[in-house]
């Protein structure tokens, strides 16, 4: 049961921060005007991955899509790919996550082909969201970098009286629901990490046992178990005689369905 | 067509009070941003007070911020400009002015304008 | 604020002769989002308020004759007059559309000679 809580939990995690980068890779408000020094201005200028837009004080905004591709900056494409990657791996896990729910039957799908579907798409959701992290993080940088960089040059003076401000530009809501929506898709992928252990036909631990001398009586004990990750060696079935003997944790063993009694 | 009519004018004495109304007619008027503009007796246009389509944001001029409010009634498609405590060199003809959508932030239709005179 | 400095202050020109009004700001009013530039140019005839004829610097408002033309960047702008008819006498202002307070120049009278 907290097994399946666990996974689909994961899933509804995962979904919702590859909707929130799919939303932060759409959005024009990754970079904002600055208005430290000019809080009334009658233009605000913003700018996405894909376009730039400007609001004006009328009401009316104008966006300009970002026509040239060689022309743009290699750090901008560079962010474009990461979010790219970011929403392809999490859309593919969350493909192979929908048919890795436990709660939803395909066929006679054993456990641990779900539980390796489970993994892979966790694997995934893990990778999507370091992608947008890494993505939003690198305009983040972009931007500070720029940002003092115009700082440094803000006012050029022509004779000291006429003065060109240079437009200054700050984070933009874009990166705050980026690097959210990216943290959220990293934990959901944890999460499916952790339903996919155990998700995983139980297997049998073999434990040293110590013996002693007891009569001719013979009793059959299980032995310990160990969660499977799908991938370990199945050694199921395997019936140990131990002749009174008591493994060191015996304690917190219990019968699985592969014992016989 | 588009029409803006101001009144609500007439002689204050300082530190008194007065409401400017604009009736707006021809357009779609919670659209638009809207400005008071006065000119005063020298002829010099002074830009006095904006406030955007929604009402959300205003702006004022630094020497009546504090004593004017901007207002609007979109279901009235009315313009308001409460003055207060006001002053001799408010002394002008208020022109009640609409914003154009893509003219720049320039203001493209105005009103006829109503006068004030702030004396004692 | 955005000192808007118009020059010259009145101007007579012959009908027919060019008229030109220079107008400078002491910001620019160039917005690099979308290379446009904020200035505005209206006229005023006498009794009347004051009627929009150019915006964004260079863009005629619709209506307004073709002799007008706006040009300009940054800081410096020109309304330019190609043939003065007797209707264009009046009195011409330029104004800041970029940032608030939108300030406006003290105007510049245009008469015939």
């Known amino acids: 049961m907290a097994v399946t809580a666990c996974q689909g939990l994961g899933f509804v995690v995962s979904l919702i921060g590859i909707a929130g980068i799919i939303a932060a890779t759409c959005m024009d408000q990754w970079s904002t005007q600055d208005l430290y020094n000019n809080p009334v201005t009658a233009v605000f200028n913003y700018q996405g991955l894909w376009r730039s837009c400007v609001r004006e004080s009328s009401g009316f905004t104008e966006c300009r899509g970002y026509f040239t591709l060689l022309g743009l900056p290699a750090m901008l494409q560079a962010v474009r790919a990461l979010m790219i990657v970011g929403i392809v791996l999490g859309a593919i896990g969350l493909l192979v996550s929908i048919f890795a729910l436990k709660c939803i039957r395909i066929g006679s799908m054993e456990d641990s082909a779900k539980a390796n579907m489970t993994l892979t798409s966790g694997i995934m959701f893990i990778v999507s969201g370091l992608c947008a992290i890494a993505g939003v993080s690198v305009f983040a940088n972009m931007l500070v970098t720029n940002f003092w960089m115009s700082t440094a040059n803000m006012y050029t003076g022509m004779g000291g009286m006429v003065q060109t401000v240079q437009t200054r530009y700050t984070f933009g809501a874009a990166l705050f629901v980026g690097w959210v929506a990216g943290g959220l898709t990293l934990i959901g992928g944890v999460m499916m990490c952790i339903a996919c252990r155990g998700l995983a036909p139980e297997e049998t631990n073999y434990k040293a046992v110590s013996y002693h001398a007891s009569g001719h009586s013979v009793a059959y004990k299980p032995g310990g178990f160990k969660a499977s990750t799908g991938f370990g060696s199945n050694t199921k079935n395997k019936k140990i005689y131990d002749g009174g003997a008591r493994t060191e944790d015996e304690v917190q063993s219990y019968p699985s369905k592969h014992d016989y009694v | 067509e588009v029409m803006l009519v101001e009144s609500g004018g007439g002689l204050v004495q300082p530190g008194g009070s007065l409401r400017l109304s604009c009736a707006a007619s021809?357009?779609?008027?919670?659209?638009?941003?809207m400005s008071w503009v006065r000119q005063t007796p020298g002829k010099r246009l002074e830009w006095v007070a904006t406030?955007?389509?929604?009402?959300?944001?205003?702006y004022y001029l630094d020497s009546v911020k504090g004593r004017f409010t901007i207002s609007r009634d979109n279901s009235k498609n009315t313009l308001y400009l409460q003055m207060n405590s006001l002053r001799a060199e408010d002394t002008a003809v208020y022109y009640c002015?609409?914003?154009?959508?893509?003219?720049?932030?320039?203001?493209?239709?105005w009103g006829q304008g109503t006068s004030i005179t702030v004396s004692s | 604020d955005i000192v808007m400095t118009q020059s010259p202050d009145s101007l007579a020109v012959s009908l027919g002769e060019r008229a030109t009004i220079n107008c400078k700001s002491s910001?620019?009013?160039?917005?690099?989002?979308?290379?446009?530039?904020?200035l505005a140019w209206y006229q005023q005839k006498p009794g009347q308020p004051p009627k929009l004829l150019i915006y964004?610097?260079?863009t005629r408002e619709s209506g307004v004759p073709d002799r007008f033309t706006g040009s300009g960047f940054g800081t410096d702008f020109t309304l330019t007059i190609s043939s003065l008819q007797a209707e264009d006498v009046a009195v011409y202002y330029c104004?800041?559309?970029?940032?608030?307070?939108?300030?406006f120049g003290a105007g510049t009278k245009l008469e015939i000679k």
């Open positions: 964004g610097a260079s």
């Open positions: 406030i955007v389509g929604g009402g959300g944001y205003t």
């Open positions: 910001q620019s009013l160039f917005n690099s989002g979308n290379q446009k530039n904020y």
């Open positions: 021809g357009f779609t008027f919670s659209t638009y941003t």
């Open positions: 104004q800041n559309d970029h940032t608030y307070p939108l300030t």
């Open positions: 002015a609409r914003m154009g959508l893509t003219q720049r932030n320039a203001l493209d239709y």
